[in-house]
């Protein structure tokens, strides 16, 4: 498993500020988990990277995942002046120059190498929880979020806002 | 034009219960959770939960886990808060807000209801 | 719960001060935290969100401050309109708690 280390953390601070065009309102280094506590953990495999989701021995150094914010025009925005309407997006990247991206063909959440500026399938929407877990949502396929399946992440369709709270598209975010 | 309108002031007994309403207009009502938060003469601001219109969830602050009730009725984009077993100390201002950000907390209030004064009195 | 602290609790200033009003939270938020103005009978107004990220609307004499755990409001040169009550508030995780609230007064 591959992380970023705490002086990576800095040396590659908002990744040449520009990932869009705009610069994210902040970044933050976190180990993702699923809502029952299982790690998202990252392998270099036949020279690429794949994507797990496993429960880590004791004492096993959680991987570390790079959240990047950015605000974003929510396409509902009924108002068209710009003030209604704000979204949350994030990208998520757990080693330099790759990136989380969503492939929506192959309901399949895949790690790129890309250049900036990111394509739209490496953003999502993000939804916090009264749990305080959060969920991410495709940009480019609203009500498709990254979700647990078969011990990977996959892209799961939320059929109905009822499920908006299903516990495999729920995820914590923590420092250590 | 966002507006977030509510009912007017009510005046209760010790032991009774009030139900306040704020009627959404000017956004899609269930792309963001509605909260409720208070304000008693002269004090600051305390937050009592809030409720998610796409799917009724609902959080509540733990000093109003018991007495308070927060729903919704998605034909007319309107909210509602309940408090039971009102007490003197309930006398506040009660607001309704909408968060800034869709789907999230993280950008605070943006859009908040006039207020609506329950006074609790004997 | 998140326990969000201010002050001072109220301070007096005259027209053309600079006024600051810090604001601590009681565990990392990053920079989640926005700053609303109240003035009496009425309802709060956002003014700052993200920290730094001024409200549509909003003078540009106002500014914030701060991520993880400390945050400031800074007015560059107090109006005769900025008189009021400023709360903070943190967004990061519920229950979502607001500061006790700083007033500023005419000196």
């Known amino acids: 498993a591959f992380g970023i280390s705490g002086v990576q953390k800095y040396t590659r601070a908002l990744h040449d500020s520009s990932i869009t065009g705009i610069s994210p309102i902040t970044e933050y280094l976190a180990s993702l988990s699923t809502y029952n506590d299982q790690s998202i953990t990252f392998a270099l495999e036949d020279e690429s990277y794949e994507i797990y989701v496993e429960d880590l021995k004791k004492d096993e150094k959680k991987d570390k995942v790079l959240l990047s914010y950015y605000e974003s025009q929510h396409p509902s925005n009924e108002s068209g002046d710009g003030v209604d309407g704000k979204m949350l997006m994030v990208t998520l990247s757990p080693t330099k120059d790759f990136w989380l991206h969503a492939n929506n063909k192959e309901h399949s959440v895949e790690l790129h190498k890309c250049e900036k500026p990111l394509p739209d399938q490496a953003f999502f929407v993000l939804h916090n929880m009264h749990s305080n877990c959060v969920s991410f949502e495709c940009k480019t396929d609203p009500g498709v979020f990254i979700g647990v399946k078969d011990n990977h992440l996959a892209l799961i369709k939320v059929d109905s806002s009822e499920n908006l709270c299903t516990e495999n598209i729920l995820f914590k975010l923590s420092e250590t | 034009e966002v507006q977030l309108v509510q009912s007017g002031a009510e005046v209760k007994k010790p032991g009774a219960s009030v139900k306040v309403s704020c009627k959404a207009s000017?956004?899609?009502?269930?792309?963001?959770?509605m909260n409720w938060v208070r304000q008693a003469p002269g004090q600051g601001l305390e937050s009592i939960g809030d409720i998610n219109p796409k799917n009724g969830d609902t959080f509540y602050n733990q000093n109003f886990k018991d007495r308070a009730t927060l729903t919704i009725d998605k034909s007319t984009s309107t909210a509602y808060l309940e408090l039971s077993s009102l007490r003197s100390e309930d006398t506040a201002v009660y607001y309704c807000?909408?968060?800034?950000?869709?789907?999230?907390?993280?950008?605070?209030?943006?859009?908040w209801g006039q207020g609506t004064l329950v006074t609790v009195s004997s | 719960d998140i326990q969000m602290t201010q002050s001072p609790s109220s301070l007096s200033a005259s027209v053309g001060d600079r006024v600051t009003i810090t604001c601590h939270a009681s565990?990392?938020?990053?920079?989640?935290l926005s700053w609303y103005q109240q003035k009496p009978g009425k309802n709060p107004k956002l003014l700052i969100y993200a920290a730094s990220k001024l409200h549509t609307g909003v003078p540009s004499r106002f500014s914030g401050s701060g991520s993880g755990t400390d945050f400031t409001l800074t007015i560059s040169s107090l109006q005769p309109e900025d008189f009021a009550t400023y709360y903070c508030q943190q967004g990061q995780s519920y229950p979502l708690t607001f500061g006790q609230g700083t007033k500023v007064e005419i000196k």
């Open positions: 565990q990392n938020i990053n920079v989640w």
């Open positions: 807000a909408r968060h800034y950000y869709y789907g999230s907390s993280y950008g605070g209030f943006v859009y």
């Open positions: 000017g956004y899609t009502f269930s792309d963001y959770n």
